[in-house]
C-alpha cells in the first residue's frame, strides 16, 4: 500500500530573468527512493538518480542547475517558462508518486511565492 | 552528423596502464554524458562508468571504482578511459556511447576499441 | 545491482514471422529499460527507450511494451536484416545489461 505523501513548494511566481528552486519532498514512506524525474508538461527536464546523479537534458543543461537535494534551480527565467511542473518519485517498493508545482514567471517586480501545499 | 570516433586496438602487458580516447563531432560533449561500456569477446555488455563533462562529475561500476579513470578534454571534444593493472580479463572491446537526452540509455555509439592483454 | 534475464538464450525465426524477446528484473524498476541490436563486428544499436518509446530511424516493426520487473520487445515481421544480438538495459539503479538474446533468421 502507498502511504507517502508529496509536499511541493505549490503555486510559484517569480521575475523574468531570475532564478526559481522547484522543491518536493516526499514523506510518511519507508519506501527508498531510486529516481526522481523533473518535467516540465510533458518534457523531461532532468533526472536525479540515487546511484547515477544527475541527468540534465541537454536542451536545459545550460539553466537548470541540479539541487539543493533533489529539487531543480530554474535559471535565466523567460515568460515561456510558465506552467506545470512535476516531481515523479520512483520509489522501492511502493511505487510512483507525482507532485505538481505551478510556475508564473512575471514580467514585473511584483512576484511573491505561493503557499505550500500537499499532493496525497 | 553526430558521432563518437575511437583510438584504434591496442596490445598491452598484464599490469599495465591503457589510455582509449573517444572523439565526438557533430556535438559539444559539454551538453551531454559520455559513458564507457565493456564488452569482452562473445559476451554481454558491461558498464564502467560516466562523465558530465561540463564539470568533469564522474561515476563509476563499483567492479570499475579505483582502476578506471574516465575524464575529458572540452578544447578537443574528446573523452578518455584509463585503465590501470590490466589482466587478461580486460580483454574486451570499450565502447564510448553518449546518453540520451532525456535519461541514461545511449543513443550514439563509437565504433568501439580492441584492448588486448598480453605477455 | 539489478539483474536483467533475456529469454530466450537463442531463438531461430523464419522472415515475416513475429518475434517476441523477454526481459525480467529482479526488482521493480518502473519503465527504465531499454532495448539495443547488436550485429557482428559492430556496436549496439539503440532499439527502444523507456520500455515503449520509439526511437527515430528505428523500423516500425520493432516495439516494446512492459513495465515493473517483466518486458518485452516484439519484431512484428521479421526481416533477414534482424539477425543479430538483443540486450536490454535498465536506468533504475547502476546501470547493467541482460546477458542478450540471439537472433537467428532460418
Known amino acids: 500500500m502507498m502511504t507517502g505523501t508529496i509536499e511541493t513548494t505549490g503555486n510559484i511566481s517569480a521575475e523574468k530573468g531570475g532564478s526559481i528552486i522547484l522543491q518536493c519532498h516526499l514523506s510518511s514512506t519507508t519506501a527508498q527512493v531510486t529516481q526522481v524525474n523533473w518535467e516540465q508538461q510533458d518534457q523531461l527536464l532532468a533526472i536525479c538518480n540515487a546511484d547515477l546523479g544527475w541527468h540534465i537534458s541537454p536542451s536545459f543543461k545550460d539553466r537548470v542547475a541540479p539541487g539543493p537535494g533533489l529539487g531543480l534551480t530554474l535559471q535565466s527565467l523567460t515568460v515561456n517558462d510558465t506552467g506545470e511542473y512535476f516531481c515523479i518519485y520512483h520509489t522501492y517498493p511502493d511505487g510512483t508518486y507525482t507532485g505538481r508545482i505551478f510556475l508564473e514567471v512575471l514580467e514585473s517586480s511584483v512576484a511573491e511565492h505561493g503557499a505550500r501545499f500537499q499532493i496525497p | 552528423e553526430v558521432q563518437l570516433v575511437q583510438s584504434g586496438a591496442e596490445v598491452v602487458k598484464p599490469g599495465a596502464t591503457v589510455k582509449l580516447s573517444c572523439k565526438a563531432s557533430g556535438f559539444n560533449i559539454k551538453d551531454t554524458y559520455i559513458n564507457w561500456v565493456k564488452q569482452r569477446p562473445g559476451k554481454g555488455l558491461e558498464w564502467i562508468g560516466r562523465?558530465?563533462?561540463?564539470?568533469?562529475?564522474?561515476k563509476y561500476a563499483e567492479k570499475f571504482q579505483g582502476r578506471a579513470t574516465i575524464t575529458t578534454d572540452t578544447s578537443s571534444n574528446t573523452a578518455y578511459l584509463q585503465l590501470s593493472s590490466l589482466r587478461s580479463e580486460d580483454t574486451a572491446v570499450y565502447y564510448c556511447p553518449k546518453s540520451g537526452d532525456y535519461g541514461w540509455y545511449f543513443d550514439v555509439w563509437g565504433q568501439g576499441t580492441m584492448v588486448t592483454v598480453s605477455s | 545491482d539489478i539483474v536483467l534475464t533475456q529469454s530466450p538464450d537463442f531463438q531461430s525465426v523464419t522472415p515475416k514471422e513475429k518475434v517476441t524477446l523477454s526481459c525480467r528484473a529482479s526488482q521493480s524498476i518502473s519503465n527504465n529499460l531499454h532495448w539495443y541490436q547488436q550485429k557482428p563486428d559492430q556496436s549496439p544499436r539503440l532499439l527502444i527507450k523507456y520500455a515503449s518509446q520509439s526511437i527515430s530511424g528505428i523500423p516500425s516493426r520493432f516495439s516494446g511494451s512492459g513495465s515493473g520487473t517483466y518486458f518485452t520487445l516484439s519484431i512484428n515481421s521479421v526481416e533477414a536484416e534482424d539477425f543479430g544480438m538483443y540486450f536490454c538495459?535498465?536506468?533504475?539503479?547502476?546501470?547493467?545489461f541482460g546477458q542478450g538474446t540471439k537472433l537467428e533468421i532460418k
Open positions: 562523465i558530465d563533462p561540463a564539470n568533469g562529475d564522474t
Open positions: 538495459q535498465q536506468s533504475n539503479s547502476w546501470l547493467t
